[in-house]
Interface confidence: low
Amino acid sequence: QPPPPPPDATCHQVRSFFQRLQPGLKWVPETPVPGSDLQVCLPKGPTCCSRKMEEKYQLTARLNMEQLLQSASMELKFLIIQNAAVFQEAFEIVVRHAKNYTNAMFKNNYPSLTPQAFEFVGEFFTDVSLYILGSDINVDDMVNELFDSLFPVIYTQLMNPGLPDSALDINECLRGARRDLKVFGNFPKLIMTQVSKSLQVTRIFLQALNLGIEVINTTDHLKFSKDCGRMLTRMWYCSYCQGLMMVKPCGGYCNVVMQGCMAGVVEIDKYWREYILSLEELVNGMYRIYDMENVLLGLFSTIHDSIQYVQKNAGKLTTTIGKLCAHSQQRQYRSAYYPEDLFIDKKVLKVAHVEHEETLSSRRRELIQKLKSFISFYSALPGYICSHSPVAENDTLCWNGQELVERYSQKAARNGMKNQFNLHELKMKGPEPVVSQIIDKLKHINQLLRTMSMPKGRVLDKNLDEEGFESGDCGDDEDECIGGSGDGMIKVKNQLRFLAELAYDLDVDDAPGNSQQATPKDNEISTFHNLGNVHSPLK
């Protein structure tokens, strides 16, 4: 073992270094002192450190550690924060488009219903937005309210337009009859199934991203213990007390110290891994009725089909309701001409064709791939921080917390540290309360994510599948079938391209009335949106 270098006779180097940490030199000895009052940098001989300097070093060491931790998590934090914002905005855009598609359908096909229909549709999609953001709204109630509100208007405006004003107090009866008589057939139930499943998954997806931000924020702002501060001080600053200004800590020693300091944080690792894998499972399942983009953008077609269903049964229905709601029919229902095909106005559905299309789905998968590169983030933190702070390469000629050594030996270092500080003790103390809380939150979200993504027949799908709601797929082409069956059906090719509302914002007020019946070609809407470089750091 090489002899310790002679101490700086004047503590000059130490004074100039410490001056940068703490203006004023009153705490720095002018010449080496015995240092018997030191508690961390226990001297083997004369030292250039005082107790006050030690305290300042500890404070600085903890601050350094906090900064290193924050810079370590910066990229991950940015990734999740930006994607949470991006997806929240994207979902809002999808909801807005879905509302406008639905309003356009009413304006083009049922202009006599529009004032009230717009109001009900607006309320429904407002509730959809609130639900996605976590509001305690029941999806079935939302759908029921939409159809409960629509039916009296459909009945009084379309089916029995000659009702006198005195008979218009039957609205409450009509709302009740709507369910009793299943006037819309199974369409409300179909919509409930699709909307509740897709929104539930969307909501948990956003919740999970927001919790991801909370996890990073929590670990980002951890206050390290005094014990950790002492270890860091010994590693980073105690060499200065011996005048060893250029010596770097041994890499192996740094890892031991970091593992001690990070013992609590590293406990998050298991749940963080599970979080990313559970989120991936959820994302992999977000298609068809588990994809809100697919479901909401097809709602206008399903609602259109449901109204056609009412119209097809209007004769019998009018008689039944006449008795049920105790009002006399003013005139027989005359089946007006309601075209089977949906009018789609090109102005309402302006399209931006883009070569590199990007769907919400592909964006989700891209996020998961990026998140998976951070799957070992917490277990790798000690090593990451050591690699981003000054350490000696190959563990040669380095500082082991007590002295300059030619080669670092973990066993020797630990034996030498026993009197000063027990690393094992630090690890056994367990995580900070804030870490325990965030672990509990991760456990909870992982539980929810697992519940959402049961691969072999999700628990509550069984009966619904048996009722045939998901039968009748559109075949093997790329297009996803949306809405019910029949002539009113529409294909939305490759789904909405989201985020940058480049070419249009649907404005129903600008949409002309019933111009002309759409051709089959018009019915194949390609709604392409490009992400562009609006959020360039993620591109």
Epitope: V139, D140, M192, Q447, K456, L460
Partner: antibody, heavy 117, light 108 residues
Framework: QVQLVQSGAEVKKPGASVKVSCKAS????????MHWVRQAPGQGLEWMGI????????SYAQKFQGRVTMTRDTSTSTVYMELSSLRSEDTAVYYC??????????WGQGTLVTVSS | QPVLTQPPSVSVAPGKTARITCGGN??????VHWYQQKPGQAPVLVIY???DRPSGIPERFSGSNSGNTATLTISRVEAGDEADYYC???????????FGTGTKVTVL
């Protein structure tokens, strides 16, 4: 505090039906799924099925398919389990249990159903 | 429907450790929950997700799960621990919750 209060004991004849209720309080009824579990005298626990009080959708154990019906009344925060075509081997204590995607954190006190001619 | 096998009974002296096993094919890949049931009472959750303990459950109760066996361990057994214990898993192949056969713990 969370409570699940079940209806009282029932004695039924073979071939009859029984409807057991489970009234929930102390939490948002529609936020938690409810399961039904039964236990024959001196026997183990047996899972019967699940109901989502929010939408009313259900999933039943294969063994009880066609004989069991689970329903809910959100206005009274009550779930019901009806078992038809009763036989003597259906004599058991029937429990409702609150579920949130994992373990059962709260159970009802149990309802003894005796099937005897 | 897969069977979760538990020993019918386990006897243990006060202050000693009781271990209750729950055997099932590749049970380590599933989350296991454990319930305690005293005579005439509803079951009570004692361990969930293999090893987590609900608030109010003493630290003496712990769980582990790997391979084909999950284990509930009760250390420093007390007279009040005398009860039936059941393990439970979600079986994805049948979309059923499955309970173990149950173990009666007797404190000598």
């Amino acid at each position: 505090q969370v409570q699940l209060v079940q209806s009282g004991a029932e004695v039924k004849k073979p071939g009859a039906s029984v409807k057991v209720s489970c009234k929930a309080s102390g939490y948002t009824f529609t936020s938690y799924y409810m399961h039904w579990v039964r236990q024959a005298p001196g026997q183990g626990l047996e899972w019967m099925g699940i109901i989502n009080p929010s939408g009313g959708s259900t999933s039943y154990a294969q063994k009880f398919q066609g004989r069991v019906t689970m329903t809910r009344d959100t206005s009274t925060s009550t779930v019901y389990m009806e078992l038809s075509s009763l036989r003597s081997e259906d004599t058991a204590v029937y429990y409702c249990a609150r579920w949130h995607g994992g373990p059962y954190d709260y159970w009802g006190q149990g309802t003894l159903v005796t099937v005897s001619s | 429907q897969p069977v979760l096998t538990q020993p019918p009974s386990v006897s243990v002296a006060p202050g000693k450790t009781a271990r209750i096993t729950c055997g099932g094919n590749n049970i380590g890949s599933k989350s296991v929950h454990w319930y305690q049931q005293k005579p005439g009472q509803a079951p009570v959750l004692v361990i969930y997700y293999d090893s987590d303990r609900p608030s109010g459950i003493p630290e003496r109760f712990s769980g582990s799960n790997s391979g084909n066996t999950a284990t509930l361990t009760i250390s420093r057994v007390e007279a009040g621990d005398e009860a039936d214990y059941y393990c439970q898993v979600w079986d994805s192949s049948s979309d059923h919750y499955v309970f173990g056969t149950g173990t009666k713990v007797t404190v000598l």
